[in-house]
């Protein structure tokens, strides 16, 4: 799903108040839910029948430094019998979301939000057929 | 998939350098990459054999301040006849996600990142069945 | 192991009601959703009706809807299902099952016999 524009106003103090010195802001340390856990199904991108294989990048400058992307095995679904139905299309489900980008030079530290595209799994859609004349 | 802990050693500066005053550090306006757009395919919510709802949750003080969270429609999977096939399981897809939490007192503004899990859409999978003894 | 026990089945006259429990127990891992089959003596496996555990939303099979009742009590780890107005046609072994998404466990079964 989609993450609007800032529009800048969101990161902006109210107007009666001075202005954000130097185009930045105050970021407290420390996560809030920071031990919150994703409680999936035990290995759902080998049983689903739009099954994916995942991919994990690494940036020691970005957090989280791991970022998971995962990719459909199959253009097309697999069926009862355990074979690949093309009549089906194997389609990723893709999530915008937050990384934060940290940036230094000496000891001169600073942050900046990063939009970032993960495909997260896929699932299996009907597709619509469209004869061309 | 999984964001790890802080650890907090991502947001502090090298050893040899002075510590960061306050537990905060310099958050930088404005958001790389912010034009990026997911580009999934159209209405896959519907046309899904594993289908799903939205649900909008909307927070002023959080950035994006629009999450929105997938529900899977059935429990089980729609087979090509249309009929709800109940030896197969729609299943949550599930992403943890950064947002940013904006806190005020007057002209006083600070940020904190926050983790948030949003079930993103799902998948069709057939399980594995087990009889207890 | 999980361990599911069914109880509450019986011989009850049409018309008549029956309340079925199911125990769970063991490593109930992620619950996606949990409920009840039923198997009518020389036909196969039906599904009469399931809970869904991250929001509560309750499912029924379309020849049960409006009769049956599915409810849990978390801190009993108790299971139910309410028979209203049974029919002939209920007579059945219900079966109890959690399932994780990725794997379904059955119980071994109560027998419900209806008779006109």
């Known amino acids: 799903r989609k993450i609007p524009k800032v529009g800048h106003t969101f990161f902006q103090k109210p107007e009666s108040c001075p202005p954000v010195p130097g185009g930045s802001m105050k970021l407290d340390i420390g996560i809030i839910n920071e031990n919150q856990r994703v409680s999936m199904s035990r290995n759902i991108e080998s049983r689903s029948t739009s099954p994916w294989n995942y991919t994990v990048t690494w940036d020691p400058n970005r957090y989280p430094s791991e970022v998971v992307q995962a990719q459909c095995r199959n253009l097309g679904c697999i069926n009862a019998q355990g074979k690949e139905d093309i009549s089906m299309n194997s389609v990723p489900i893709q999530q915008e979301t937050l990384v934060v980008r940290r940036k230094h030079q000496g000891c001169s530290v600073s942050f900046q939000l990063e939009k970032v595209l993960v495909t997260v799994g896929c699932t299996c859609v009907t597709p619509v057929i469209h004869h061309v004349q | 998939r999984k964001i790890p802990k802080v650890g907090h050693t991502f947001f502090q500066k090298p050893e040899s350098c002075p510590p960061v005053p306050g537990g905060s550090m310099k958050l930088d306006i404005g958001i790389i990459n912010e034009n990026q757009r997911v580009s999934m395919s159209r209405n896959i919510e519907s046309r899904s054999t594993s289908p799903w709802n939205y649900t909008v949750t909307w927070d002023p003080n959080r950035y994006p301040s629009e999450v929105v969270q997938a529900q899977c429609r059935n429990l089980g999977c729609i087979n090509a006849q249309g009929k709800e096939d109940i030896s197969m399981n729609s299943v949550p897809i599930q992403q943890e996600t950064l947002v940013v939490r904006r806190k005020h007192q007057g002209c006083s503004v600070s940020f904190q990142l926050e983790k948030v899990l949003v079930t993103v859409g799902c998948t069709c999978v057939t399980p594995v069945i087990h009889h207890v003894q | 192991q999980v361990q599911l026990v069914e109880s509450g089945g019986g011989f009850v006259q049409a018309g008549g009601s029956l309340k079925l429990s199911c125990s769970v127990s063991?490593?109930?891992?992620?619950?996606?959703?949990m409920g009840w089959f039923r198997q009518p003596p020389g036909k196969g496996r039906e599904f009469v009706a399931g809970i869904r555990w991250s929001d509560g939303s309750t499912f029924y099979g379309d020849s049960v809807r409006g009769r049956f009742t599915i409810s849990g009590d978390n801190a009993k780890h108790t299971l139910y299902l309410q028979m209203n107005s049974l029919k002939p046609d209920d007579t059945a072994v219900y079966y109890c099952?959690?399932?994780?998404?990725?794997?379904?466990?059955y119980g071994q079964g109560t027998l419900v016999t209806v008779s006109s």
């Open positions: 099952y959690i399932d994780s998404g990725s794997d379904r466990y």
């Open positions: 063991g490593n109930t891992f992620i619950t996606n959703h």
